[in-house]
């Protein structure tokens, strides 16, 4: 029972994680304009992996895609690649894990096959989570480097008379979504690997020996016992584990009712 619960929970956690990785990859707010010195701004810039956006205080938002491939920074390309690899591995892992779930019966699939599939999907989830975490971390590192570089020459101009304020960027919501999602996928993968150990039938390296009792001929084969899980032919005990994933509407919070600028 515990093995099935671990496998089911691992699947649900990984599913939520991969959904989060996909969401993070698609989000526009990987980097957002730093508002530390100016919490109320008339023009707000933010950037994603695929496009950059500008939101005016009038409410008008304009997004422009990065239509060049060769002109983009190598780091951005690397982050894109890591996220896509993470999504692909995660998606394949989900597909494999569906068939590996103990609560789903497909023909006469052996438990050993399900164990192998569970392990495979678990490893895929772990790699997927690591890819997402790596991608987000690389981007975050790039932001930190650029932030301090722009801080160093915050104001440039002609003899200090005219100020050209450089736009500084800080961590966007997508980074946090990516980190959490990557972590969840990783945890889900570990849970699947743990579940695999419980699913695999214990094998011994000595042959079966027949014991002959008087009047009866019974063959005992060591290693042929399986732990009762409550699943299998007895379908009355089936439990569905709900991951409880829910999406909350994004709530925009304002620093105060009235802003003075």
């Amino acid at each position: 029972m515990a093995v099935t619960a671990c496998q089911g929970l691992g699947f649900v956690v990984s599913l939520i994680g991969i959904a989060g990785i996909i969401a993070a990859t698609c989000m526009d707010q990987w980097s957002t304009q730093d508002l530390y010195n100016n919490p109320v701004t008339a023009v707000f810039n933010y950037q994603g992996l695929w496009r950059s956006c500008v939101r005016e205080s009038s409410g008008f938002t304009e997004c422009r895609g990065y239509f060049t491939l060769l002109g983009l920074p190598a780091m951005l390309q690397a982050v894109r690649a890591l996220m896509i690899v993470g999504i692909v591995l995660g998606a394949i892992g989900l597909l494999v894990s569906i068939f590996a779930l103990k609560c789903i019966r497909i023909g006469s699939m052996e438990d050993s096959a399900k164990a192998n599939m569970t392990l495979t999907s678990g490893i895929m989830f772990i790699v997927s989570g690591l890819c997402a975490i790596a991608g987000v971390s690389v981007f975050a590192n790039m932001l930190v480097t650029n932030f301090w570089m722009s801080t160093a020459n915050m104001y440039t101009g002609m003899g200090g008379m005219v100020q050209t304020v450089q736009t500084r960027y800080t961590f966007g919501a997508a980074l946090f979504v990516g980190w959490v999602a990557g972590g969840l996928t990783l945890i889900g993968g570990v849970m699947m690997c743990i579940a695999c150990r419980g699913l695999a039938p214990e094998e011994t390296n000595y042959k079966a020996v027949s014991y002959h009792a008087s009047g009866h001929s019974v063959a005992y084969k060591p290693g042929g016992f399986k732990a009762s899980t409550g699943f299998g032919s007895n379908t009355k005990n089936k439990k569905i584990y709900d991951g409880g994933a829910r999406t909350e509407d994004e709530v925009q919070s304002y620093p105060s009712k009235h802003d003075y600028v």
Epitope: V43, G59, F60, V165
Partner: antibody, heavy 118, light 113 residues
């Protein structure tokens, strides 16, 4: 068509308060910020602040801190600008103006003359 | 606050001639995110509210005659009336639309010679 109709002229004594209204029509009232701009006689334009009727969020010019209050009534598509502790230098024509892309003001009210005199 | 300075304060031009009004800001109005300059030009005729002519420094508002054009980037901007008409007599204002509080230039009065 878009129309912004403001309330009539007001004469106030120093220290008093004035509340100017601006009734909007011809567009989705709750979806656009409304700005307030004033113009002293023979002078240039000065931005006072803005309000988003959709949720009542406001942004004010620091110069008017604590003296200005902007409100909106969605049921009547009207925005209000109240200025307290009036001084003689507050004598001006007060305009409401719709805020659009480019952070520009495309439609303006006809203006409300507020005279502060003892 | 960003200070907007217009020049000249007043301008007298013959009908059909070109009129050029300059506007200088104390800080760049160019937004790096979309490479747009957040400067707006308004026309105010006597006894009337201002009318928006140009936004994003060079984008003409619909319904505005094409003799009006805006140019410039960063801190230096220009409003050009290619062929001045009698109805163009007004005061012209530039406005910083990039940073709060929004600020206006002192205005340039256009007259007919």
């Amino acid at each position: 068509q878009v129309q912004l109709v403001q309330s009539g002229a007001e004469v106030k004594k120093p220290g008093a308060s004035v509340k100017v209204s601006c009734k909007a029509s011809g567009y989705a009232f709750s979806s656009y910020w409304m700005n307030w701009v004033r113009q002293a006689p023979g002078q240039g334009l000065e931005w006072i602040g803005q309000i988003y009727p959709g949720n009542g969020d406001t942004t004010y010019n620091g110069k008017f801190k604590g003296r200005v209050t902007m409100t909106a009534d969605k049921s009547t598509s009207t925005v209000y600008m109240e200025l307290s502790s009036l001084r003689s230098e507050d004598t001006a024509v007060y305009f409401c103006a719709r805020f659009v892309k480019g952070n520009a003001m495309d439609y303006w009210g006809q203006g409300t003359l507020v005279t502060v005199s003892s | 606050d960003i200070v907007m300075t217009q020049s000249p304060d007043s301008l007298a031009v013959s009908l059909g001639e070109r009129a050029t009004i300059s506007c200088k800001s104390s800080q760049s109005l160019l937004n790096s995110g979309n490479q747009k300059n957040y400067l707006t030009w308004y026309q105010q005729k006597p006894g009337q509210p201002p009318k928006m002519l140009i936004y994003w420094a060079s984008t003409r508002e619909s319904g505005v005659p094409d003799r009006f054009s805006g140019s410039g980037s960063g801190i230096d901007f220009t409003l050009t009336i290619s062929s001045v008409q009698a109805e163009d007599v007004a005061v012209y204002y530039c406005q910083n639309a990039y940073s709060y509080p929004f600020t206006f230039g002192q205005g340039t009065k256009l007259e007919i010679k």
